[in-house]
């Protein structure tokens, strides 16, 4: 049967993003409509047809455009994605003979981790703090020269859609740690990044 091929995309916040749909059919459509999927009913964003060209709905006027003007292959581009743009989008190809054939492409917005790593001595112990803020939520791990060192982790969700994960390494005999390297590892979207800290006696 006739189908539409799509691909989900993950793009960084405040960058452009494109979603593409391809009608796997011998014939082009009469009109292509892009809609955003919403809880109640989909919201029309933009249409393209030979008769009327590109027609963008007012709410999307400065946000998107159709960057591939095709009736078999259609691409919409968001100029500068925000968290509100995250979600799933439907492309509807209104075809002669077979009606509306739809596909769904989903857009996920990510924010690269911002990491801070610092340490603080007290009289009898050393606290090393690693904090990573990202979207989706990052994970924080420690690589230390010896085992048995305790750590505690706190997760905080922010209104802007990012999540902070803060892990504190509690070292009871700080003298042994002086001059040694501690590595905070941040895992985000399948990539692990090492942040190194050498403890100096303050």
């Amino acid at each position: 049967q006739v189908q539409v091929v799509t691909q989900d995309e993950r793009e960084q916040l405040y960058t452009p993003a494109s979603l593409k749909c391809s009608l796997q059919n011998a014939q082009e459509a009469l009109i292509v409509t892009w809609q955003k999927k919403k809880a109640v009913s989909p919201e029309n964003m933009v249409t393209f047809s030979e008769n009327h060209g590109v027609v963008i709905q007012p709410a999307y006027k400065d946000k998107i455009n159709i960057t591939q003007l095709g009736l078999q292959n259609s691409t919409i581009t968001f100029w500068n994605i925000t968290l509100e743009d995250e979600g799933c989008y439907m492309c509807l190809f209104n075809t002669f003979g077979f009606g509306k054939i739809s596909g769904t492409a989903c857009l996920t917005v990510y924010v690269q981790p911002i990491v801070s790593l610092h340490y603080k001595f007290s009289e009898d112990h050393l606290n090393i703090t690693c904090s990573a803020t990202a979207r989706p939520a990052p994970m924080v791990f420690w690589k230390v020269p010896r085992s048995g060192i305790e750590n505690s982790t706190v997760t905080l969700s922010h209104p802007n859609g990012t999540t902070s994960v803060t892990s504190i390494l509690h070292i009871k005999d700080p003298k042994n740690q002086v001059g040694k390297e501690v590595i905070c590892q941040v895992l985000h979207l399948g990539t692990v990044t090492d942040f190194k800290q050498t403890v100096n006696k303050g």
């Epitope: 006739v2 011998a26 014939q27 082009e28 008769n51 075809t95 002669f96 003979g97």
Partner: antibody, heavy 117, light 107 residues
Framework: QVQLVQSGAEVKKPGASVKVSCKAS????????ILWVRQAPGQRLEWMGH????????NYNLKFKGRVTITRDTSASTAYMELSSLRSEDTAVYYC??????????WGQGTLVTVSS | DIQMTQSPSSLYASVGDRVTITCKAS??????LSWFQQKPGKAPKSLIY???RLVDGVPSRFSGSGSGTDFTLTISSLQPEDFATYYC?????????FGQGTKLEIK
């Protein structure tokens, strides 16, 4: 040059089936939809259904309640329309045509199907 | 199903006349309408598609207009070969349906 050549006239008894062929030549068969319409004596044209030869996807007028089947043989560049459980009101001229989207340009010569006991 | 109603059902005119045939849909069909000409014993011939686009090879005296529910086929100056039956077809919604036809005859 483009041609759609239909099979010859048929006389059938009520309850029987008829299969009309439409042989295409002069173009790439899978690039165009093949459609079937019919016209009973003194009546308006009636859309029966169509097929996209590329995928073999077809769509039928539900008025025919499953009595119509449209198929194609891409190797023979031929489309077929089969109508079963024939009744007298199916007596009509059956036409195949081709379309690129909604652009209809070539038609077969028509096939008269007479249903009579 | 969408009903297509043509008017008039028959029309008498002379060579050189300007003729208008209308087609009304029972619901909005956007611009998804074609016009066909048919002569006795012959297959239909496509004249106009998408309400106002002329099919290649069709004389420019034929024109189409309208959108939504009301459509018009105009022949600006009738020629002898134009006497035939004309049908509209909607293809906005399946099943696609034809009008009942307008028979154009010599006055």
């Amino acid at each position: 040059q483009v041609q759609l050549v239909q099979s010859g006239a048929e006389v059938k008894k009520p309850g029987a089936s008829v299969k009309v062929s439409c042989k295409a030549s002069g173009y790439s068969f899978t690039d165009y939809i093949i459609l079937w319409v019919r016209q009973a004596p003194g009546q308006r044209l009636e859309w029966m259904g169509h097929i996209d030869p590329y995928y073999g996807s077809s769509n039928y007028n539900l008025k025919f309640k499953g009595r119509v089947t449209i198929t194609r043989d891409t190797s023979a560049s031929t489309a077929y329309m089969e109508l079963s459980s024939l009744r007298s009101e199916d007596t009509a001229v059956y036409y195949c045509g081709r379309s690129k989207r909604d652009y209809f340009d070539y038609w077969g010569q028509g096939t008269l199907v007479t249903v009579s006991s | 199903d969408i009903q297509m109603t043509q008017s008039p059902s028959s029309l008498y005119a002379s060579v050189g006349d300007r003729v208008t045939i209308t087609c009304k849909a029972s619901q909005d069909i956007n611009s998804y309408l074609s016009w066909f000409q048919q002569k006795p014993g012959k297959a239909p011939k496509s004249l106009i598609y998408r309400a106002n686009r002329l099919v290649d090879g069709v004389p420019s005296r034929f024109s189409g207009s309208g959108s939504g529910t009301d459509f018009t086929l105009t022949i600006s100056s009738l020629q002898p070969e134009d006497f035939a039956t004309y049908y509209c077809l909607q293809y906005d919604e399946f099943p696609y349906t034809f009008g009942q036809g307008t028979k154009l005859e010599i006055k």
